[in-house]
Interface confidence: low
């Protein structure tokens, strides 16, 4: 006769590891005990259980309450065993040794592997802002037994960098995911993907990327000066911008306050009826926490008495 | 402040069992590793084994049919045992604090135990 | 295990120097190394740890750097303070250490 069983057994953190261990012996051999060590190199072997074919089953006391035979129906030549709630601490090297009737003892090993899956944490890199170098957006680490792998699925541009850190039972994995920061990528999601043999599918965690901008300023409204003459009702400048954060706006006329009447509403300042009082030099502040912009424009309020146009000039300053 | 203290016999009868003991102050020892590192003229610095937060033991393979570290969190002492001893055992013995990793940011100040007859 | 071999043996050195010490392991530690220093009778103290990161209060003179198999520990404008021995150590699996460098006054 021979003895089945497996050359690796692996298990997840917290399963219950079946060690298997069956005699396949001639017609009418008996097994008469079953004994279960741990026995890893350098050290002695620790006795796990007696599988006895008349007393049945004995645990040692330092596994007691964690060695079971398997649930029935059960084959007298099966002496394999249930090792329950298997930890880090289990992994190694396990024998079986058979003693039958009348063939005499077999012996077997196998090695225990437990997988110890990965509990992953990302970590968003320093604020992201137009006009930086190469920036950390994220890191990820894993730690688990083996060591995870840690890779980015995202749409976005940039590169990459691992380090392991080997510890004495599992490893840590940390990826780090850089970027030179744009406006483009504000909103676009950097997912951190974990993979293990003990995870029955990929964890992902995602970041969502913040790029803090403010663009150059313009105003509108002036583009045709023959509209801006006395009289004229509804007339309005509009500054326009977009940044991260939202911007706020501001209007100042650059050569004394400005003119009663005229409304501030946001990004829009609001004339009454157009007089020649109107005209002046305003000026659109825009700001966020990142940076501010100005944009000027010079009004002229035309008068139809007169025949000549006046120019209209528009400036931009940042 | 973050403290270690060994302690033990500085003489041991060689084949007889070397037994020391780490007690700690200013951290938990369920929060932290504690290392066993030995000196000697003859070999340097040797990590002998550590008994982790969480109450799991790791062992220097060369050592770990000698070696059992064991704890009693209530009076957050580590205790140390080497087995066997003979003469070459004879160094100075620390004990030593780490968290996750192997590296070792507080140390006891060391006693000296010498293996003679 | 991985053997760390640490140079020079000992050097000497003034006051105001700057002093550099190797340490070359026997295969990738993945920057998995600490350095501590040891002044006679005393217990060693951590320096450096992963490589290039130093340990809580260590003056800003002392630097760590290195990756793979090679790295190094540079102390610039020496002090009287910092003479003794100083000695790596992987943290990669089981540790060991370097035999040490001591750093002499000269």
């Known amino acids: 006769g021979e003895l089945e069983t497996s050359d690796v057994v692996t298990v997840v953190l917290g399963q219950d590891a079946k060690l298997p261990c069956f005699y396949r012996g001639d017609s009418g051999e008996q097994v008469g005990q079953v004994a279960w060590a741990r026995v890893d190199a350098g050290e002695g072997a620790q006795e796990l259980a007696l599988l006895h074919s008349k007393y049945g089953l004995h645990v040692s006391p330092a596994y007691e309450g964690r060695v079971e035979q398997p649930p029935p129906p059960r084959n007298p030549l099966d002496g394999s065993v249930l090792l329950r709630n298997a930890v880090q601490a289990d992994e190694g090297e396990y024998e079986c040794r058979v003693s039958t009737f009348p063939a005499g003892s077999f012996q077997a090993r196998l090695r225990l592997r437990v997988l110890v899956p990965p509990l992953p944490s990302l970590n968003p890199g320093p604020a992201l802002e137009e006009g930086q170098g190469l920036t950390l957006a994220a890191s990820c680490t894993a730690e688990g037994s083996p060591a995870p792998s840690v890779t980015w699925d995202t749409e976005v541009k940039g590169t990459t960098s691992s380090r392991s850190f080997k510890h004495s039972r599992s490893a840590a994995v940390t990826s780090e995911f850089h970027l030179v920061p744009s406006r483009s990528m504000n909103g676009q999601p950097l997912t951190c993907v974990v993979s293990h043999p003990g995870l029955l599918q990929d964890q992902r965690i995602t970041h969502i990327l913040h790029v803090s901008f403010l663009a150059e300023a313009s105003v509108r409204g002036l583009e045709d000066q023959n509209l801006w003459h006395i009289g004229r009702e509804g007339a309005m400048l509009k500054c326009l911008s977009e940044g991260q954060p939202p911007p706020s706006y501001n209007w100042t006329r650059l050569d004394g306050p400005l003119p009663s009447g005229v409304r501030v509403d946001g990004d829009t300042l609001g004339f009454p009826p157009l007089t020649t009082e109107h005209s002046g030099i305003y000026v659109c502040h825009v700001s966020n926490e990142f940076s501010s912009r100005d944009s000027q424009v010079t009004v002229d309020v035309l008068d139809p008495q007169e025949d000549s146009g006046k120019q209209v000039d528009l400036v931009s300053a940042s | 402040q973050v403290q270690l203290k060994e302690s033990g016999p500085g003489l041991v009868q060689p084949s007889e069992t070397l037994s020391l003991t780490c007690t700690v102050s200013?951290?938990?020892?369920?929060?932290?590793?504690v290392h066993w590192i030995r000196q000697s003229p003859g070999k340097g610095l040797e990590w002998l084994g550590v008994?982790?937060?969480?109450?799991?033991?790791d062992y220097n393979a060369a050592f770990v049919s000698r070696v059992t570290i064991s704890r009693d969190n209530s009076k957050s002492q580590v205790f140390f045992k080497l087995n066997s001893v003979q003469a070459d055992d004879t160094a100075v013995y620390y004990c030593?604090?780490?968290?996750?990793?192997?590296?070792?940011?507080?140390w006891g100040q060391g006693t000296t135990v010498t293996v003679s007859s | 295990d991985i053997q760390m071999t640490q140079s020079p043996a000992s050097l000497s050195a003034s006051v105001g120097d700057t002093v550099t010490i190797t340490c070359r392991a026997s295969?990738?530690?993945?920057?998995?190394l600490a350095w501590y220093q040891q002044k006679q009778g005393k217990s060693p103290q951590l320096l450096v740890y992963?490589?290039?990161n130093l340990a809580d209060g260590v003056p800003s003179r002392f630097s760590g750097s290195g990756s793979g198999t090679q790295y190094t520990l540079k102390i610039n404008s020496l002090q009287s303070e910092d003479f003794g021995t100083y000695y790596c150590?992987?943290?990669?699996?089981?540790?060991?250490f370097g035999g040490g460098t001591k750093v002499e006054i000269k």
């Open positions: 295969q990738n530690i993945y920057s998995n």
């Open positions: 150590q992987h943290f990669w699996g089981t540790p060991t």
């Open positions: 992963a490589a290039t």
């Open positions: 008994i982790w937060s969480g109450g799991s033991t």
């Open positions: 200013g951290f938990s020892i369920t929060n932290y590793g």
């Open positions: 030593a604090r780490s968290g996750k990793w192997y590296y070792f940011d507080y």
